[in-house]
């Protein structure tokens, strides 16, 4: 899966929540960021994530589509210079400081099985998705397309009216 351009085709800020409306939050602890899945209090501000969308070509042996065989890759950045990374060895999702060009571990294939929710498939480990496990984000193996609808890998993106990226 090769990214077809070095620049994203679009970027926007959104807050990320689970299918059950828990918020994904990011906290700086001991000079590293921790990722939490939690219920926010009524007026608590949601953390925002910069989503950058990139076009990507299917590997030629995987699709008969030719130029038509495009998909969307996303990177997710909750704060400047930090991106979500897939740690496939530990089956974990981590926030790491990176410089561009970003490593493959920072790219996720975008899926939406429902019109109002999305899933993020690891670029470096096809069939493995960001999911929720024990109030944390983790990498979860999905063995068939039917299981793409399992709620623990579905996330909602809600628009934000703030245009800063803290």
């Amino acid at each position: 899966m090769s990214i077809t351009g070095i620049s994203p085709i679009t970027e926007y800020l959104a807050s990320l929540s689970t299918y059950n409306d828990q918020s994904i939050t990011f906290a700086l602890e001991d000079e590293s960021y921790e990722i939490y899945v939690e219920d926010l209090k009524k007026d608590e501000k949601k953390d925002k994530v910069l989503l950058s969308y990139y076009e990507s070509q299917h590997p030629s042996n995987e699709s008969g589509d030719g130029v038509d065989g495009k998909m969307l890759m996303v990177t997710l950045s909750p704060t400047k210079d930090f991106w979500l990374h897939a740690n496939n060895k530990e089956h974990s999702v981590e926030l790491h400081k990176s410089e561009k060009p970003l490593p493959d571990q920072a790219f996720f294939v975008l899926h939406n099985m429902h019109s109002n929710s999305v899933s993020f498939e690891s670029k470096t480990d096809p069939g493995v998705f960001i999911g929720v496990k024990d109030n944390h984000l983790a990498l979860i193996k999905v063995d068939s397309s039917e299981n793409l609808s399992t709620e623990n890998i579905l996330f909602k993106l809600s628009e934000t009216h703030h245009h800063h990226h803290h």
């Epitope: 085709i9 679009t10 926007y12 959104a14 969308y53 076009e55 299917h58 699709s63 008969g64 589509d65 038509d68 065989g69 495009k70 998909m71 969307l72 294939v109 975008l110 899926h111 939406n112 099985m113 429902h114 019109s115 109002n116 999305v118 397309s145 039917e146 793409l148 609808s149 628009e159 009216h161």
Partner: antibody
Framework: EVQLVETGGGLVQPGRSLKLSCVAS????????MYWIRQAPGMGLEWVSS????????YYLDSVKGRFTISRNNAENTVYLQMNSLRSEDTATYYC??????????????WGQGTLVTVSS | DIQMTQSPSVLSASVGDRVTLSCKAS??????LDWYQQKVGEAPKLLIY???NLQTGIPSRFSGSGSGTDYTLTISSLQPEDVATYFC????????FGQGTKVEIK
């Protein structure tokens, strides 16, 4: 080369049923959301229905909910629109379209030539 | 539901003119906006996706811009073959077309 060929249109009386088919070729059908969009004579475009890659999730325009059913057969590269209880206001050219990207419901990357449905007594 | 409003309904311009078509959404659509061109007797075709990305094979005189609720399609130098109706379309929440802008040559 991507091709979408719609069939099944025609003249039908109000209250009757019609089933539209769209046969796809030139791309990996099971990777893409598929759609039906319609256009009444001399009017604009109106999204009618969507179905995700595996057919597990379907969406409809409010005015056709309960009357129209979208489905797909990935083995046969075909998407269907079953239209029941047809009304005169359903008269339109019905277009089949495919998603622009694999796996996502963003953009209509390619359209068929359409099939005309006329509902009249 | 998100409503999409296009203006003007009809635009008449001369060959070579720079023309601008407008599309306004009832809510923020996060740049999830396309433009489609439909010539008389033909199926629509995708011109621009995600606000400002030109579909393969579309001439570079077409460009898109915008954010939030306000979006624009610009034809930098109108050509006779650009006579068509242009529809904006949002997919941020559900799927909705604008009512179209018909572009004519004076």
């Amino acid at each position: 080369e991507v091709q979408l060929v719609e069939t099944g249109g025609g003249l039908v009386q109000p209250g009757r049923s019609l089933k539209l088919s769209c046969v796809a070729s030139g791309f990996t059908f099971s990777n893409y959301w598929m759609y039906w969009i319609r256009q009444a004579p001399g009017m604009g475009l109106e999204w009618v229905s969507s179905i995700n890659n595996d057919g597990g999730n379907t969406y409809y325009l409010d005015s056709v909910k309960g009357r129209f059913t979208i489905s797909r057969n990935n083995a046969e590269n075909t998407v269907y629109l079953q239209m029941n209880s047809l009304r005169s206001e359903d008269t339109a050219t019905y277009y089949c379209a495919k998603g622009h990207y694999s796996y996502t419901s963003y953009s209509f990357g390619y359209w068929g030539q359409g099939t005309l449905v006329t509902v009249s007594s | 539901d998100i409503q999409m409003t296009q203006s003007p309904s009809v635009l008449s311009a001369s060959v070579g003119d720079r023309v601008t078509l407008s599309c306004k959404a009832s809510h923020n659509i996060n740049k999830h906006l396309d433009w489609y061109q439909q010539k008389v007797g033909e199926a629509p075709k995708l011109l621009i996706y995600f606000t400002n990305n030109l579909q393969t094979g579309i001439p570079s005189r077409f460009s898109g811009s915008g954010s939030g609720t306000d979006y624009t399609l610009t034809i930098s130098s109108l050509q006779p073959e650009d006579v068509a109706t242009y529809f904006c379309f949002q997919y941020n929440s559900g799927w909705t077309f604008g009512q179209g802008t018909k572009v004519e040559i004076k």
